[in-house]
């Protein structure tokens, strides 16, 4: 099941997935002056079998002057309301993001892409946050968020985050010495 | 500091809608999910529903067909408006940060000082 | 609806000495339980969640305990501030409040 939502919004900070669940989107989105090659994919789906997950289709850009038109580009589906958007940063390219089984790594960038990712995500998904340059990072619990189905909707949890104004950043999940979170207790379910 | 304040008609007449606004100050309404809750007089609290900067709202299935929640990210505010009002509806009405933890742990960790509606002819 | 009932409706208790305020649910809540302090025109101030963690900036006195359908919070040493409105307030289904509990000096 799609998310109805992007994760909150943390002032100073940027959120990322370390790896996408399968049925995550990626919308094939094109630079200015860019467009999807007639006839390409939408989105990219994350799929997979017991073994491997990958992405299907290929996103696919090519230049808008070779056609006579103002059209927008890369229209979204039109059941996809929601604007997922990471940033592309490389360097926030985890080691070790997919050995999960069951997810898709960060796919490789293509020609003429767009500089923002727009995602759909799926419940399950996980998204962890940062703070940005010239922030540091004040934890009361995890720095992440996921996107649960509690009570016949989709909502994200809140990520346990302050980005304060000093010159000192933290990092994504994979490259810190991870942190103790404050209960000790298991998940519960909530039954609705 | 994050700080909430209803505002609102103190008094509705029955068959009326009530209509209120919780002003999110020291903070971004993007960062959470907000809630309505009430209490009546000498009664115990009720939750409402809540609402995301998206839009995106939950209910109570006991006042689902008479309460809309909604949000203006640009003036920083969410709203309540529960219609047909009758006595009953008569309460202390609180606006509220709505917490879901990783852990599933759903609760409300920062309140508004809440505003008085009476329903009354 | 899950029912939360809270007992007793007013404690007496002096200053210095422990108080124990019960909640109970009307069907299991496992350990998705609140509590909640208000004192006379105030707004609710949350104390503890998930049954026994006590909230940021809570002080130790209050402790939390239970699961399933009994719970119980526990002020140690009750100081003069500490004389409120306590509600529990599960979200195992939805949410429902207690009636809540009246702590008075004694």
């Known amino acids: 099941e799609l998310c109805d939502d992007d994760p909150p919004e943390i002032p100073h900070a940027t959120f990322k997935a370390m790896a996408y669940k399968e049925g995550t989107m990626l919308n094939c989105e094109c630079k200015r002056g860019f467009r999807r090659i007639k006839s390409g994919s939408l989105y990219m789906l994350c799929t997979g079998n017991s073994s491997h997950s990958s992405w299907d289709n290929q996103c696919q850009c090519t230049s808008s002057a070779t056609r006579n038109t103002t059209k927008q580009v890369t229209p979204q589906p039109e059941e996809q309301k929601e604007r997922k958007t990471t940033e592309m940063q490389s360097p926030m390219q985890p080691v070790d993001q997919a050995s999960l089984p069951g997810h898709c790594r960060e796919p490789p960038p293509w020609e003429n892409e767009a500089t923002e990712r727009i995602y759909h995500f799926v419940v399950g998904q996980m998204v962890y946050y940062q703070c940005v340059q010239g922030y540091r990072a004040l934890h009361r619990g995890p720095a992440e968020s996921v996107c649960k189905m509690t009570h016949g909707k989709t909502r994200w949890t809140q990520p346990q985050l302050i980005c304060t104004g000093e010159m000192e950043t933290s990092q994504f999940p994979g490259e810190e010495k991870p942190q103790a979170s404050p209960e000790g207790r298991p998940e519960s379910e909530t039954s609705c | 500091q994050v700080q909430l304040q209803e505002s609102g008609p103190g008094l509705v007449k029955p068959s009326e809608t009530l209509s209120l606004t919780c002003t999110v100050s020291g903070g971004s309404i993007r960062s959470y999910y907000w809630s309505w809750i009430r209490q009546p007089p000498g009664k115990g609290l009720e939750w409402i529903g809540y609402i995301y900067y998206s839009g995106s709202t939950n209910y109570n299935p006991s006042l689902k067909s008479r309460v809309t929640i909604s949000v203006d990210t640009s003036k920083n505010q969410f709203s309540l408006k529960l219609s047909s009002v009758t006595a009953a509806d008569t309460a202390v009405y609180y606006c509220?940060?709505?917490?879901?933890?990783?852990?599933?742990?759903?609760?409300?960790?920062?309140w508004g000082r809440g505003t008085l509606v009476t329903v009354s002819s | 609806e899950i029912v939360m009932t809270q007992s007793p409706a007013t404690l007496s208790v002096s200053p210095g000495e422990r108080a124990t305020l019960s909640c109970r649910a009307s069907q299991s809540v496992s350990s998705n339980l609140a509590w909640y302090q208000q004192k006379p025109g105030q707004a609710p101030r949350l104390l503890i969640y998930g049954a026994s963690t006590r909230a940021t900036g809570i002080p130790a006195r209050f402790s939390g305990s239970g699961s399933g359908t009994e719970f119980t919070l526990t002020i140690s040493s009750l100081q003069s501030e500490d004389f409120a409105v306590y509600y529990c307030?599960?979200?195992?289904?939805?949410?429902?409040f207690g009636q809540g509990t009246r702590l008075e000096i004694k």
């Open positions: 509220a940060r709505d917490i879901l933890t990783g852990y599933s742990d759903w609760f409300f960790d920062l």
């Open positions: 307030q599960q979200y195992n289904n939805w949410i429902t």
